[in-house]
């Protein structure tokens, strides 16, 4: 039994890090493998993660972590019974994938303006709380070509757009994701999408 692709891990910079790897053949990850992880400091405990299957030869492990700080560094040991298959380390602050934003809402009651709001996925004391920027994806359910991305580079989790920039009388969907430049993070997963019917009054044409 050998590791084909070494574990790569990402942290939500709060409570979970997710590690994925591939074995050299079909593996029952939960019965055959264990990933041990330990915070590097005196008297820290070793924790055991039971991996789950992620495709035939793929395994995934969710490592529970206490409130991450930038100095945290973990040793990782992948075991198959008594055999050490791989040894490595992981610094969560260097491999961050933020949590997805939540509660995306489209407010259509402001005249001819769409207000999209969502929630920051971190509590105020978390370092990422004040460092997230967002991308909002809006698309038409009727026309696959009507697909647009708005970059929200300010901290407020909201976006205003003129309803007239979208077609009237049809349904749209929106979703949002986050990243933090300060930690050079990857993008978060997209939030669940929300749907609304876009309608606005066309201005009278003056001749």
């Amino acid at each position: 039994m050998k590791v084909l692709q070494e574990p790569t891990c990402v942290s939500d910079y709060m409570s979970i890090s997710t590690c994925e790897w591939k074995m050299n053949g079909p593996t029952n990850c939960s019965t055959e493998l264990r990933l041990l992880y330990q915070l590097v400091f005196l008297l820290s405990e070793a924790h055991t993660c039971i991996p789950e299957n992620n495709g035939g030869a793929g395994c995934v492990c969710h490592l529970l972590m206490d409130d991450v700080v930038s100095a945290d560094n973990y040793t990782l040991d992948l075991w198959a019974g008594q055999q050490l298959l791989w040894k490595g380390s992981f610094k969560p602050s260097r491999h961050v994938k933020p949590r997805a934003p939540g509660n995306l809402t489209v407010h259509t009651n402001v005249s001819d303006t769409l207000l999209l709001t969502w929630s920051n996925p971190y509590p105020p004391d978390n370092y990422l709380y004040n460092h997230l920027t967002y991308a909002v994806n809006i698309w038409s359910e009727n026309d696959p070509a009507d697909f647009r991305i708005y970059n929200v580079t300010y901290l407020e989790p909201s976006l205003r757009i003129a309803a007239s920039t979208l077609k009237s009388g049809i349904s749209y969907r929106a979703r949002v994701r986050a990243w933090a430049q300060c930690y050079n993070t990857t993008w978060s997963e997209w939030s669940p999408s929300t749907k609304w019917h876009n309608s606005y009054r066309e201005p009278f044409e003056q001749h």
Partner: antibody, heavy 115, light 107 residues
Amino acid sequence: QVQLVESGGGLVQPGGSLRLSCVASGFTFSHSSMNWVRQAPGKGLEWVSYISRATGAVYYADSVKGRFTISRDNAKNSLYLQMNSLRDEDTAVYYCAREPVFDYWGQGTLVTVSS
Amino acid sequence: DIQMTQSPSAMSASVGDRVTITCRASQDISNYLAWFQQKPGKVPTRLIYAASSLQSGVPSRFSGSGSGTEFTLTISSLQPEDFATYYCLQWSSYPRTFGQGTKVEIK
């Protein structure tokens, strides 16, 4: 091995105050965020409060906000819950529980609020 | 605040039965969900975290699934020691919230 021992429970009148303590051993307390969780007699679990190891930030359940205060003394390996303006509905066994996500619990201390 | 609704609140089952308990969140919590078991007079113990990750030392007859708002705890073959109360917990955001519990009793 990890051990959490709560104390300070007892009988108190409505409107009174009580201070619960939780002494930790078997791990580096200063590196762990901590929680208080309670359970009223014959009822379910209710999260009460959290204190972060990293920032010292605190969070509370709406039912205790403004009345309870969580704190810690890393030098004494101790977690505290100061409970003021106690009500009948605060009667419960109070557990301290360690992060991440309540991996270890104490045995609990019973708080009875009654006149 | 996020509400967690567990069902059923109580159930009777026999040794060897397959038992399923569900937990519904009032809003999306991704996979930030854990399951706990509590026996009478005892302290709760964590069975599952991150919706589907089995806690080390917990028998493999316990499994968890789900993401977003719908979650399930399954006991594939109920054993005598599994008669207890089970709670789900969301830790996606503060305040953290538990489900109201599901008591699994002997039929």
